[in-house]
């Protein structure tokens, strides 16, 4: 392991479309991939009239957008579906939205999801 880098071994798993996709609904996912490549966790969610609806959480393959991010934060301004990725086991348990272009307060507080 490279010093100072959080290795991602496991991620929180959630799939709102678990029946259609024929997967588990919730759990912990072990992350697999090429041994020399980095692994990350991700979370996706929607903000429906101020209510957070998780779409998916799980493992994410080597992506420079996620390097050295210990927190799962979406920075894109007003996406249709929010997406964040991070490094470190279970780092996708909490996720938040801080749009990069905004100088005002973030539109949502950090979220600790509680799947229905």
């Amino acid at each position: 392991a490279i010093l100072g880098r959080s290795e991602t071994q496991e991620c929180i798993f959630y799939n709102a479309n678990w029946e259609r996709d024929r997967t588990n609904r919730t759990g912990v996912e072990s992350c697999y991939g090429d041994k020399d490549k980095r692994r990350h966790c991700f979370a996706t969610w929607k903000n429906i009239s101020g209510s957070i609806e998780i779409v998916k959480q799980g493992c994410w393959l080597d992506d420079i957008n996620c390097y050295d991010r210990t927190d799962c934060i979406e920075k894109k301004d007003s996406p249709e579906v929010y997406f964040c990725c991070c490094e470190g086991s279970m780092c996708n348990e909490r996720f938040s939205y801080f749009p990069e272009m905004e100088v005002t307060q973030p539109t949502s507080n950090p979220v600790t999801p509680k799947p229905p």
């Epitope: 994410w60 992506d63 420079i64 957008n65």
Partner: antibody
Framework: QVQLVQSGAEVRKPGSSVKVSCKAS????????INWVRQAPGQGLEWMGT????????SYAQKFQGRVTITADTSTSTAYMELSSLRSEDTAVYYC????????WGQGTLVTVSS | QSALTQPRSVSGSPGQSVTISCTGT?????????VNWYQQHPGKAPKLMIY???KRESGVPDRFSGSKSGNTASLTISGLQAEDEADYYC???????????FGGGTKLTVL
């Protein structure tokens, strides 16, 4: 093992559209991007666009903006690339590739545009 | 999103070393470690050889190495072998906030 299997060759008339599919297996489809690249006969590789299958977020090369649409169906682990308003210069082999590093590629789909 | 610049062709004898350059700008080649190298044999799909400037893809011989200086990346193949004869492309990571771009390709001939 990771595999990306693309749909078969297509022949289209100028002005029409084509939709190429890319079915992924051997890994979790929602764990990385799918990129689309094309290669005209005797020419180099040309990046067309990318999709994050889990969020549906897409980015397209300026050259193809407005003419290309990339989608993904997570229930079948399949990505699609649709190119509209076809012209003869769009005759090429179209490839899908996994991830930001393009570490696995489909076998390619030849699209011929001819009147 | 201009194409990266590569020499059209390079050649070398078996056992020799060759270097292929790939020149871009500060927003593609010069930005972070985004550069990859691909090998393509005639009629085949490209194959990832080097990613992140200098990391060898699994299964790629250590005769292949990558480096970068400023806005120019380089692929060096040492101990040339006949099967190395192919087209080589540089390209950048694509996904999220990053757009992709490829070089025009370099034909490597093993004499």
């Amino acid at each position: 093992q990771v595999q990306l299997v693309q749909s078969g060759a297509e022949v289209r008339k100028p002005g029409s559209s084509v939709k190429v599919s890319c079915k992924a297996s051997g890994y979790t489809f929602t764990s990385s991007y799918i990129n689309w690249v094309r290669q005209a006969p005797g020419q180099g590789l040309e990046w067309m666009g990318t999709i994050n299958p889990v969020s549906g977020s897409t980015s397209y090369a300026q050259k193809f903006q407005g003419r290309v649409t990339i989608t993904a169906d997570t229930s079948t682990s399949t990505a699609y690339m649709e190119l509209s308003s076809l012209r003869s210069e769009d005759t090429a082999v179209y490839y899908c590739a996994r991830g930001g590093w393009f570490d696995y590629w489909g076998q390619g789909t030849l699209v011929t545009v001819s009147s | 999103q201009s194409a990266l610049t590569q020499p059209r062709s390079v050649s070398g004898s078996p056992g020799q070393s060759v270097t292929i350059s790939c020149t871009g700008t500060s927003s593609d080649v010069g930005s972070y470690n985004r550069v990859n190298w691909y090998q393509q044999h005639p009629g085949k799909a490209p194959k990832l050889m080097i990613y992140g400037v200098s990391k060898r893809e699994s299964g790629v011989p250590d005769r292949f190495s990558g480096s970068k200086s400023g806005n120019t990346a380089s692929l060096t193949i040492s101990g040339l072998q006949a099967e190395d004869e192919a087209d080589y492309y540089c390209g950048t990571f694509a996904g999220g906030r990053y757009y992709g771009v490829f070089g025009g390709g370099t034909k490597l001939t093993v004499l």
